[in-house]
């Protein structure tokens, strides 16, 4: 069994190295920014929505294109839940320093957890998306 796990880990590692997760990162960042543009963000100052909607985000076409490419990449991990989790963790690691607020970080994690389901894939049951060094608010 140990031997099988070792081979599984190696296979996952090479899958992760081959995968291009950028479209997933681009899709998620566009999605959480689009949501903020729509609903405003800071509950303490509703009259001062910090970001105004931009035509770039309104189009949505770019994001759906990213989502399609993202799903194609995630599809490679469909039969290995642990490896799917590692892919999600890698996405979180790659974007954590872009998220300078608790709300943005939580929303990104929410969307990230939903990503496999959005792609019609099984989501890993237990997948810790906390970033490693420095805890939740590393950047």
């Amino acid at each position: 069994r140990q031997q099988w796990e070792l081979q599984g880990d190696r296979r996952c590692q090479s899958q992760l190295e081959r995968a291009n997760l950028r479209p997933c990162e681009q899709h998620l960042m566009q999605k959480i920014q689009r949501d903020e543009d729509s609903y405003g963000r800071d509950p303490y100052s509703p009259s001062q929505d910090p970001y105004s909607p931009s035509p770039y985000d309104r189009r949505g076409a770019g994001s759906s294109q990213h989502q399609e490419r993202c799903c194609n990449e995630l599809n490679e991990f469909e039969n290995n839940q642990r490896c799917m989790c590692e892919a999600l963790q890698q996405i979180m690691e790659n974007q954590s320093d872009r998220l300078q607020g608790r709300q943005q970080e939580q929303q990104f994690k929410r969307e990230l957890r939903n990503l496999p389901q959005q792609c019609g894939l099984r989501a890993p049951q237990r997948c810790d998306l906390e970033v490693e060094s420095g805890g939740r608010d590393r950047y």
Partner: antibody, heavy 118, light 111 residues
């Protein structure tokens, strides 16, 4: 209404220390990264330091590394900048600013003047 | 360290006329997520700076639509379609890809 109010500035001799404070109100202070930015008289803006929302991560400009320490007390909605071994070139108006959540400086205080002179 | 170079450093403008400011970075400001981490700020005389444009082209809330940002990679531009008297001040670009650094500023004044 968002308010960031800096205090603690003044005249200090080279080599001495000073602590700046920034009191925040009207914002979710403990949800966002906070920054210090300074502006020497008649000069441009210089980013000084930043601290993540939980206080775990701190970043500094090379010009202040090892001399300045940024910290925050989320229970008091206050940001601090401890400035040690001050030099004449640290003379500036110091602004605190709140991050937008995406690395932009969204809200700014009015600034406090620090003068380092013998 | 990423260095930002603005030009011109001084820009005399005529109200009603367009104006543009350039900001060049010593390295690309595109993150792997596709966004350019370049902001524009305006500091009006005697005031604190204010955010105008973030992520190269997104206008911050309350900023008039005569302001627009464009560019990608290392070359960025802030355009004012029709300058108004209240637009005078110093404009700064700022990169937020690696920590944060400002350009040296462009002073915009009425001719």
């Amino acid at each position: 209404q968002v308010q960031l109010v800096e205090s603690g500035g003044g005249v200090v001799q080279p080599g001495r220390s000073l602590r700046l404070s920034c009191a925040a109100s009207g914002i979710a202070f403990n949800d966002y990264t906070m920054h210090w930015v300074r502006q020497a008289p008649g000069k441009g803006l210089e980013w000084v330091a930043a601290i993540s929302y939980g206080g775990t991560n701190k970043y500094y400009a090379d010009s202040v590394k090892g001399r300045f320490t940024i910290s925050r007390d989320n229970s008091k909605n206050t940001l601090y900048l401890q400035m040690n071994s001050l030099r004449a070139e640290d003379t500036a108006v110091y602004y605190c600013a709140r991050d937008s959540g995406y690395r932009s400086l969204l809200h700014w205080g009015q600034g406090t003047l620090v003068t380092v002179s013998s | 360290e990423i260095v930002l170079t603005q030009s011109p450093l001084s820009l005399p403008v005529t109200p009603g006329e367009p104006a543009s400011i350039s900001c060049r970075s010593s390295q690309s400001l595109v993150h792997r997520n596709g966004y350019n981490y370049l902001d524009w700020y305006l500091q009006k005389p005697g005031q604190s700076p204010q955010l105008l444009i973030y992520m190269a082209s997104k206008r911050a809330s309350g900023v008039p639509d005569r302001f627009s940002g464009s560019g990608s990679g290392t070359d960025f531009t802030l355009k004012i379609s029709r300058v108004e008297a209240e637009d005078v001040g110093v404009y700064y670009c700022m990169q937020a890809l690696q920590t944060w650094t400002f350009g040296q500023g462009t002073k915009v004044e009425i001719k």
